[in-house]
């Protein structure tokens, strides 16, 4: 499996060949109003998708996307 593995304030791309144990490409997108943004893309052995975790706007929102095809975590999906 090949995934994008990178960390940035916005969408980023850096393709790598994942370890054999990795079955997922994972993207975590965290947005905090005062604190900024963080996009983390990685290879993952397991992955649980989530979309809206926080209740308060002031706490920001975090989402996790999972996919299982080569370079499938290229784009950010809101």
């Amino acid at each position: 499996l090949r995934c994008h593995v990178c960390t940035s304030s916005s969408n980023c791309k850096h393709s790598v060949v994942c370890p054999a144990s990795s079955r997922f490409c994972k993207t975590t997108n965290t947005v905090e109003p005062l604190r900024g943004n963080l996009v983390k893309k990685d290879c993952a052995e397991s992955c649980t998708p989530s979309y809206t975790l926080q209740g308060q706007v002031s706490s920001g929102t975090s989402s996790t996307q999972c996919c299982q095809e080569d370079l499938c975590n290229e784009k950010l999906h809101n």
């Epitope: 940035s8 304030s9 916005s10 905090e32 005062l34 604190r35 900024g36 943004n37 963080l38 706007v57």
Partner: antibody, heavy 117, light 110 residues
Framework: EVQLVESGGGLVQPGRSLRLSCAAS????????MHWVRQAPGKGLEWVSG????????GYADSVKGRFTISRDNAKNSLYLQMNSLRAEDTALYYC???????????WGQGTTVTVS | QSVLTQPPSVSGAPRQTVTISCSGS????????VTWYQRLPGEAPKLLIY???LLHSGVSDRFSGSKSGTSASLAISGLQSEDEAEYYC???????????FGGGTKLTVL
């Protein structure tokens, strides 16, 4: 070129007011939270205030709460800090800074000096 | 008194490695990422390291960051004269609801 330019500093008497401005260029201003950070003479950096991209979230350091007001005008690519009831301990070099990556100020201005005396 | 604690000064000879420590608490470094800034004389602070150990674009890989528990450190290898500067650690503080800084460490290259 990504740039932040502060202005509005100067010498002011205790109890008076001052308004700082920060002009942003080279990036999409209304995509990012912005902050004011200061450095008093011989001291370290101190966060003063921050404002989210749409002004929906605003924060202040306890030391300035109730005296300072942060605001922004996205149409003018500008950030402001209204400073009232100034004290001697507010004397510092004031920087505006852009928050891009989580919890990191990735762009800083050169600063504007405020002297309360 | 700064919320995060750094040594006021460190020094090292050219080509040596120096480490700057940063100590916090469970409400800041223990829960949130650490950022490091460099402030050269007469210049604005510059982002070096974010998210504990990630190098900002354009920063030399002689700089590296690490974190363990409520403490963090910045290592500078292959010291050069142009590394003479003040270095600040920072983290978000959940109790204060804002970013907090260390008092700064002045690095002298002997």
């Amino acid at each position: 070129e990504v740039q932040l330019v502060e202005s509005g500093g100067g010498l002011v008497q205790p109890g008076r007011s001052l308004r700082l401005s920060c002009a942003a260029s080279g990036f999409t201003f209304d995509d990012y939270a912005m902050h004011w950070v200061r450095q008093a003479p011989g001291k370290g950096l101190e966060w003063v205030s921050g404002i989210s991209w749409n002004s929906g979230s605003i924060g202040y350091a306890d030391s300035v709460k109730g005296r300072f007001t942060i605001s922004r005008d996205n149409a003018k690519n500008s950030l402001y800090l209204q400073m009232n009831s100034l004290r001697a301990e507010d004397t510092a070099l004031y920087y505006c800074a852009k928050t891009g990556i989580l919890d990191a100020f990735d762009i800083w201005g050169q600063g504007t000096t405020v002297t309360v005396s | 008194q700064s919320v995060l604690t750094q040594p006021p000064s460190v020094s090292g000879a050219p080509r040596q490695t120096v480490t700057i420590s940063c100590s916090g608490s469970s409400s800041n470094i223990g829960q949130n990422s650490v950022t490091w800034y460099q402030r050269l004389p007469g210049e604005a602070p510059k982002l070096l390291i974010y998210y504990d150990d990630l190098l900002h674009s354009g920063v030399s890989d002689r700089f590296s960051g690490s974190k363990s528990g409520t403490s963090a450190s910045l290592a500078i290898s292959g010291l050069q004269s142009e590394d003479e500067a003040e270095y600040y650690c920072a983290s978000w503080d959940d109790s204060l609801k804002g970013p907090v800084f260390g008092g700064g460490t002045k690095l002298t290259v002997l």
